[in-house]
Interface confidence: medium
């Protein structure tokens, strides 16, 4: 079943997807599409990279991370309820039927009527734990602050509720990751 990610109407949604290039600059083509991954390619493509660069994108879809290092996580800007659904991240590894396919379910919730105080401040101010990313060469470890124990699924859900979350790079373990080569 698909991993589920949440965001509120009007916020930016974050759908994680990663791979590790075999060598620096050896980019693997990736496509993002709306709808579950078909047998080949992506249906309803919203963004595409190739061996060189991002070669196609539509207005509200972009990559915030360093896609040249394999962070191909999708950001969807200013989401509406219509953005709910399954998204396909397809890492198009050369060779027959070598592609890695990840289906991610995005659930959009109506915006809260009463705005809460900035959760980003609350979240970053409260966290005694360390998060270590994997699959990207040397591990990156960052102290985030101080909050009681919380699992990565919860962290991922919180992260999706943060507009333009600066914590996204520290949440890679909750997303799809594949090592190439």
């Amino acid at each position: 079943s698909e991993v589920e990610y949440r965001a509120e109407v009007g916020q930016n949604a974050y759908l994680p997807c990663f791979y590790t290039p075999a060598a620096p600059g050896n980019l693997v083509p990736v496509c993002w599409g709306k709808g579950a991954c078909p047998v080949f390619e992506c249906g309803n493509v919203v963004l595409r990279t190739d061996e060189r660069d991002v070669n196609y994108w539509t207005s509200r879809y972009w990559l915030n991370g360093d896609f040249r290092k394999g962070d191909v996580s999708l950001t969807i800007e200013n989401v509406t309820l219509a953005d709910s659904g399954i998204y396909c991240c397809r890492i198009q590894i050369p060779g027959i039927m070598n592609d890695e396919k990840f289906n991610l379910k995005l659930v959009i919730k109506p915006a809260k009527v009463t705005p809460a105080p900035t959760r980003q401040r609350d979240f970053t101010a409260a966290f005694p734990r360390m998060l270590t990313t994997r699959g990207h060469g040397p591990a990156e470890t960052q102290t985030l602050g101080s909050l009681p124990d919380i699992n990565l699924t919860q962290i991922s859900t919180l992260a999706n509720e943060l507009r333009d979350s600066r914590l996204a790079n520290d949440l890679r373990d909750s997303g799809a990751t594949i090592r190439i080569g």
Epitope: D53, N55, L63, N78
Partner: antibody, heavy 122, light 108 residues
Framework: QVQLQQWGAGLLKPSETLSLTCAVS????????WSWIRQTPGKGLEWMAE???????DYNPSLKSRVTISVDTSKNQFSLNLTSVTAADTAVYFC????????????????WGQGTLVTVSS | SSELTQDPAVSVALGQTVRITCQGD??????ASWYQQKPGQAPVLVIY???NRPSGIPDRFSGSSSGNTASLTITGAQAEDEADYYC???????????FGGGTKLTVL
Amino acid sequence: QVQLQQWGAGLLKPSETLSLTCAVSGGSFSGYYWSWIRQTPGKGLEWMAEINHSGDTDYNPSLKSRVTISVDTSKNQFSLNLTSVTAADTAVYFCARGSRRGRYFPQPFDFWGQGTLVTVSS
Amino acid sequence: SSELTQDPAVSVALGQTVRITCQGDSLRSYYASWYQQKPGQAPVLVIYGKNNRPSGIPDRFSGSSSGNTASLTITGAQAEDEADYYCNSRDSSGNHVVFGGGTKLTVL
């Protein structure tokens, strides 16, 4: 439709400071990088600096010592200061939206201000 | 070098096809964007990414890329296409924006 409206002094003396401001309307301000680009008479375009709503900046290395870019998110505005101007800084200055939203995303400039001619003369 | 190099001037007969090129080391890793600028006006984005046109740009404009060279092709050039054309991309380090020197297109 996104619109960029720019203004600032058009005539300066050598050694003075050039100051320009660009106001953005009709679209998201926080989602983008915003740049200043200049065009000297009869010559090409030269990118000068960029900034996003968080205040993250990048500068053309050849101008970095003299250029400051700043942002006022409450007004959806960003500004350029260029110190110690000379006649070589006489140019049309444009503000523009870079549709590169992420640090590593491609950088086409899809919306531009009308341009401000700045003349440096004693 | 982080610079992008363009031919200063190119001409084309009305209705014919013309290709404007942009060369630079960084174009091996980054796609160029292309802008059209007419006298007294701000530049207008005509091609971005591999070969994408913003809305309102006629389909006679197309982009391509090979090695360290990006190309803008106008198929069936019209009188209103007479303008200066600029390419831009990142520099080789990926850290800064760079523009080509521009190509003046004359439609004969």
